[in-house]
């Protein structure tokens, strides 16, 4: 655990797993109030490596529904609309934190979990392996 | 609040903000053990919309280090290495959940926070606004 002196005014925890089990305020604060975070919504169609969104559902998790990007093509879309297979559409992946009820069905006990999601796609030059 | 009977074995919370303040196990479980999240690590250089990664550090946050993508060019890189300004490199943004110590320096009290990060860049056809 982190070596921080106990501050007065800090909640106290007698949990034997402390500091692994902590109190968390789930009234989620959004640091992005000054900008509108939903601007990138049409990139999935306008990209040279366009993607579709696929649904992943798990009722024991928050968020229960996660939409993941799947690249539409192996190659990248050229200006004329055709696909260039000399280039590759690849997913950009990012880890996100999700909450899982633990023990299951307990209304006020959760576990943080990291999952890897594909956020969108980008067009890359392929790695060419030359055979001797 | 939710009408759920108290399960035996569930942590009890006397907090006045219950259920917004809950117990969370921070022994973070990674569901992606079979995949390598570093697989996309060289895409930032090979992409037609390449990006640089900038370090954002905050000791009061978990994770304390977040890497942010910044697109290198306004346009997209062509096969010959020159930049095509008829296309746009744009950041793919994603919200991530982080934990922030609250009150500050308290080792076992946190608040969930959403922050917007740029994960990578993609090349898109620009939106052309025609003036009447």
């Amino acid at each position: 655990g982190i070596a921080i002196p106990r501050n007065s005014g800090c909640p106290n925890s007698e949990d034997k797993n402390f500091p692994r089990t902590v109190m968390v305020n789930l009234n989620i604060h959004n640091r992005n109030t000054s900008t509108n975070p939903k601007r990138s919504s049409d990139y999935y169609n306008r990209s040279t490596s366009p993607w579709n969104l696929h649904r992943n559902e798990d009722p024991e998790r928050y968020p229960s529904v996660i939409w993941e990007a799947k690249c539409r093509h192996l190659g990248c879309v050229k200006a004329d609309g055709n696909v260039d297979y000399h280039m590759n559409s690849v997913p950009i992946q990012q880890e996100i934190l999700v909450l899982r009820r633990e023990p299951r069905h307990c209304p006020n006990s959760f576990r943080l979990e990291k999952i890897l999601v594909s956020v969108g796609c980008t067009c890359v030059t392929p790695i060419v392996h030359h055979v001797a | 609040g939710i009408a759920i009977p108290r399960n035996s074995g569930c942590p009890n919370s006397e907090d006045k903000n219950f259920p917004r303040t809950v117990m969370v196990n921070l022994n973070i479980h990674n569901r992606n053990t079979s995949t390598n999240p570093k697989r996309s690590s060289d895409y930032y250089n090979r992409s037609t919309s390449p990006w640089n990664l900038h370090r954002n550090e905050d000791p009061e946050r978990y994770p304390s280090v977040i890497w942010e993508a910044k697109c290198r060019h306004l346009g997209c890189v062509k096969a010959d290495g020159n930049v095509d300004y008829h296309m746009n490199s744009v950041p793919i943004q994603q919200e991530i959940l982080v934990l922030r110590r609250e009150p500050r320096h308290c080792p076992n009290s946190f608040r969930l926070e959403k922050i917007l990060v740029s994960v990578g860049c993609t090349c898109v056809t620009p939106i052309v606004h025609h003036v009447a």
């Epitope: 789930l26 989620i28 509108n36 975070p37 939903k38 601007r39 990138s40 919504s41 049409d42 999935y44 969104l53 559902e57 798990d58 009722p59 024991e60 998790r61 928050y62 968020p63 229960s64 529904v65 996660i66 939409w67 996100i96 009820r101 209304p107 006020n108 999601v117 956020v119 969108g120 | 609040g1 939710i2 759920i4 259920p19 917004r20 809950v22 793919i92 943004q93 994603q94 919200e95 959940l97 959403k114 994960v119």
Partner: antibody, heavy 126, light 107 residues
Amino acid sequence: EVQLVQSGAEVKMPGSSLKISCKASGGSFRGYGISWVRQAPGQGLEWMGGITPFFGWADYAQKFQGRVTITADESTTTAYMELSGLTSDDTAVYYCARDPNEFWNGYYDTHHFDYWGQGTTVTVSS
Amino acid sequence: EIVLTQSPDFQSVTPKEKVTITCRASQDIGSALHWYQQKPDQSPKLLIKYASHSVSGVPSRFSGSGSGTDFTLTINGLEAEDAGTYYCHQSDILPHTFGPGTKVDIK
């Protein structure tokens, strides 16, 4: 097939309270939000509030704050909306609607209403 | 709260005609705009989510576009069964708000 089935029509006296139920079937209950939306005769749609069963808390429109309580019972997959201090202005059709509250296109807590109950007609009259 | 305005209020249309309904938000809501159809004595039904994304089971003649403050619902080739009232809904900032509705009837 997801279904939201609401309780039957009600006639209420001014000043009384109302409690409507919304029973969900055919899909996850816990993972979704349930919102309540009302529609006065010949009028448009008005959001009253919603609950996220996963966490158990509700958000309310300021107009109804203090007068409305939304709850959910996971064991019966049923959401409830209670409205107190009824007046004739509360005469309306009340709908429950499912909110996927999903992680969409890179963002948490994105909302829309993908399934609706059949509606409960409430008449407030003396 | 965010105010949504729709135009027109009412439209009388011939079958197979193209219908365009617009929705304007009082401030930038990104793509957090959804469209619903409500037929007389029925519950609303989701048609388009997040401004332009189709919904499973909804005919392909319904499409949406726009972002920020200006949004459009298009019905390409209206059919008799499309008569009803169309509402836009923003979910960017609580409280959720709806437009006043556009009533479409068949000539």
